[in-house]
């Protein structure tokens, strides 16, 4: 139990009268310290404490009586020192002095650690006027204290362009043990050791600190706040708090999650954005990050074709957007694509792994070997070549498409021509004589068209002329080839 | 240093009390707990219980309520062990250790030994 | 009150040999300290909260662990490691020990 230590305060007589006491609290203090019993005339000694002046500002008036006597010196006569009291609890404190009546218009001012207090204070003055002297007590009242009520409180008046200022009257707050500091969460490392601070304050002190761990006390014996708490280290997720103790009772903190690091889940719902005969767009939802932050990922890609080696490809890349674009496939193929994500601890598993296809592309290479020749008894001319290897067609092929540029005295015109797939030759009518013809094939795919060969060049002679020799693709670096007949 | 110094060893008879001590030095002595544990010839460690050396309070294990009994004296930093109405079961050796964060045993007295014998 | 199982209760070791003692806690600990105690001495602090040696313990002793199984691991023995080790739980009043696992040395 809490006892409390009471020591009543006596009001000070001022005048005969009913008036009000130095000392009003709807309470009973916890302590009160008066500064001196009885009524102290300015700079008059305290009999309890002897050579101790009043601390007051005092105004020595010059105006004299009819009768010359002087004024005695102005000052507030002394009230209590020091209240304390517990938190939401009313008190009501006063200041108050004797002035002659030749002053007018004196009014009186509160003050708290050297601030004006304005406004909403219910600050009351009251005058108490006789022959010559007006008594003016002014009382401060707060209702329900807090913490930041918590200070040294003085009143002010203003005579003579004198400033008369009453000794200090101390409130002190006490309550329940105030957190400054508590402990955070955290992630750590598995048996790591780390540390949790917890600070609180009162009034009353001192404070004394309890931490709790799982709902189990680490410390039997209490510690002096601020208290840092080293934790050696843990092995699973745990709650801590600390317990803050003074004589007014105990404050809890809140509870705070302290959790392990551990590796990443494996992500989720890896996904197909978008496909394209040489890359893949996927997206992938981030697993539980294991309570820290994830650094990279890595995209796993293997040919799901059972006659492939199965090797992976890793393609390394930042965790974020979740996005990541698959390149340098090959068209027309299957793969399986698994996504894994890594943090400070390690590499989580391979999300489940999906299929993906990219789609058709144009060829990747032209025909081969492209060979043309003169057939003068028909007017044609007649253009053979291989098919490009299937590896590189990117595609099922659906024909040929073969450009024919004729040139002669300074006319060129370029035609185009398709051709099914199934052959490997194709003949094209002469366009002119005289002339020479540049002929050029692109594999045709659904995914497009393909590269071109290398221009195969022909003269096409007047008619009359006889061409049994054919033109033919040169070999790799050799300059075009040009058949004159 | 850390040290904690106990009392010589006892020889009693059955029914009789004994009271031994434990001077702790080198550190505040209200900031630690004490712990006391028995250990019986040739058996293993058992937890009596702890006294608070700030609030003076003693809780003892389930095995040791009643005759024993847990004690200060701050102003010379002593905790004390008195066990009452002492039997044959309770000879052993008897040691303080003081009480850490997480119930660690940082530090051991050397351990008294009581003997009751008839 | 939680009570702590060590294996084995005695263990006869030659030197350099690898040494598992462990202790399994009827429930869950959150953590697990280890003393060595040698004839007609007081025990001393070992292993702190599983895993910390105490200060002077030598790094051939490690200890790990966690809910209700804990191991004190003795990576090479010497001769000097002969005695007798405790385990004990903090989490749940009251505090108990183990019953202890003597190494001898062959």
């Known amino acids: 139990a809490i006892t409390e230590a009471r020591e009543e305060a006596k009001p000070y007589p001022l005048f005969p009268g009913p008036f009000p006491g130095s000392l009003q609290t709807d309470h009973t203090p916890l302590l009160s310290l008066p500064h001196a019993s009885g009524y102290q005339p300015a700079l008059m000694f305290s009999p309890t404490q002897p050579g101790r002046p009043h601390t007051g500002n005092v105004a020595i008036p010059q105006v004299t009586s009819v009768e010359s006597k002087p004024l005695p010196p102005l000052a507030f006569k002394h009230t209590v020192g020091h209240i304390i009291l517990s938190e939401h609890k009313g008190v009501k404190f006063n200041c108050s002095i004797s002035v002659p009546n030749i002053y007018q218009d004196t009014t009186i001012s509160w003050w708290k650690d050297g601030k004006e207090l304005l406004g909403a204070h219910h600050a009351i003055t009251q005058f108490y006027p006789d022959d010559e002297v007006t008594a003016i007590i002014a009382s401060f009242s707060i209702t329900s204290v807090q913490r930041s009520d918590n200070g040294s409180y003085i009143c002010k008046m203003k005579i003579n362009n004198e400033e008369i200022v009453s000794d200090p009257i101390y409130i002190e707050v006490q309550g329940l043990p105030h957190f400054t500091k508590q402990p955070e969460s955290m992630n750590v490392t598995r048996n790591t050791a780390f540390n949790l601070t917890c600070q609180a304050v009162g009034p009353p002190e001192p404070v004394n600190i309890f931490w709790v761990q799982n709902s189990s006390r680490v410390n039997e014996q209490p510690e002096k706040s601020p208290s840092v708490l080293t934790v050696p280290g843990l092995t699973e997720m745990a709650v801590f708090s600390c317990e803050a103790h003074n004589d007014k009772g105990l404050t809890v903190s809140k509870g705070v999650q302290i959790n392990i690091k551990a590796i990443p889940s494996p992500p989720t719902e890896v996904s197909i954005r978008n496909s394209t005969a040489h890359s893949i767009l996927i997206s992938w939802v981030p697993g539980f990050d294991g309570y820290s932050p994830f650094r990279n990922c890595s995209i796993q890609v293997k040919e799901a074709d059972p006659l492939s080696n199965g090797s992976v490809m890793i393609f390394n890349t930042s965790a974020l957007p979740h996005l990541y674009q698959i390149k340098q496939l090959q068209a027309l193929a299957n793969y399986s694509i698994g996504v894994s994500c890594m943090n400070e601890i390690g590499w989580s598993a391979v999300s489940p792994w999906i299929l993906a296809s990219t789609t058709e592309g144009a060829p990747s290479v032209a025909p081969l070997n492209v060979t043309v020749f003169l057939n003068e008894s028909s007017d044609n001319v007649d253009i053979r070549w291989m098919k490009p290897p299937t590896k590189q067609q990117d595609g099922e092929l659906v024909g040929y498409r073969i450009s024919h540029v004729w040139q002669s005295a300074g006319i060129s015109k370029e035609l185009l021509e398709e051709v099914g797939q199934n052959g490997s030759r194709a003949r094209i009518s002469v366009q002119v004589h005289n002339a020479t013809c540049t002929v050029r094939i692109a594999a045709v795919t659904r995914g497009g068209v393909g590269p071109f060969s290398d221009p195969v060049k022909i003269f096409i002679p007047a008619h009359g002329w006889v061409d049994y020799a054919p033109s033919s693709t040169p070999a790799p670096g050799n300059a075009d080839p040009v058949l004159i007949i | 240093q850390v040290q904690l110094v106990q009392s010589g060893s006892e020889l009693k008879k059955p029914g009789a009390s004994v009271k031994i001590s434990c001077k702790a030095s080198?550190?505040?002595?209200?900031?630690?707990?004490m712990n006391w544990v028995r250990q019986a010839p040739g058996q293993g460690l058992e937890w009596m219980g702890w006294?608070?050396?700030?609030?003076?309070?003693?809780t003892y294990a389930d095995d040791f309520k009643g005759r024993f009994v847990f004690s200060l004296d701050t102003s010379v930093s002593t905790a004390y062990l008195q066990i009452n109405n002492l039997k044959a079961e309770d000879t052993a050796v008897y040691f303080c250790?003081?009480?850490?964060?997480?119930?660690?045993?940082?530090?051991w007295g050397q351990g008294t030994l009581v003997t009751v014998s008839s | 009150e939680i009570v702590l199982t060590q294996s084995p209760d005695f263990q006869s070791v030659t030197p350099k040999e690898k040494v598992t003692i462990t202790c399994r806690a009827s429930?869950?600990?959150?953590?697990m300290h280890w003393y060595q105690q040698k004839p007609d001495q007081s025990p001393k602090p070992w292993i702190k909260?599983?895993?910390n040696l105490a200060s002077g313990v030598p790094s051939r002793f490690s200890g790990s662990g966690s809910g209700t199984d804990f191991t004190l691991t003795i990576n090479s023995l010497e001769a000097e490691d002969a005695a007798t080790y405790y385990c004990?739980?903090?989490?749940?009043?009251?505090?108990?020990f183990g019953q202890g696992t003597k190494l001898e040395i062959k």
């Open positions: 080198g550190y505040t002595f209200t900031n630690y707990g």
């Open positions: 250790a003081t009480y850490g964060h997480y119930a660690w045993f940082a530090y």
């Open positions: 006294i608070n050396t700030y609030t003076g309070e003693p």
């Open positions: 429930s869950s600990v959150s953590y």
């Open positions: 909260a599983t895993s």
């Open positions: 004990q739980q903090w989490g749940t009043k009251p505090l108990t």
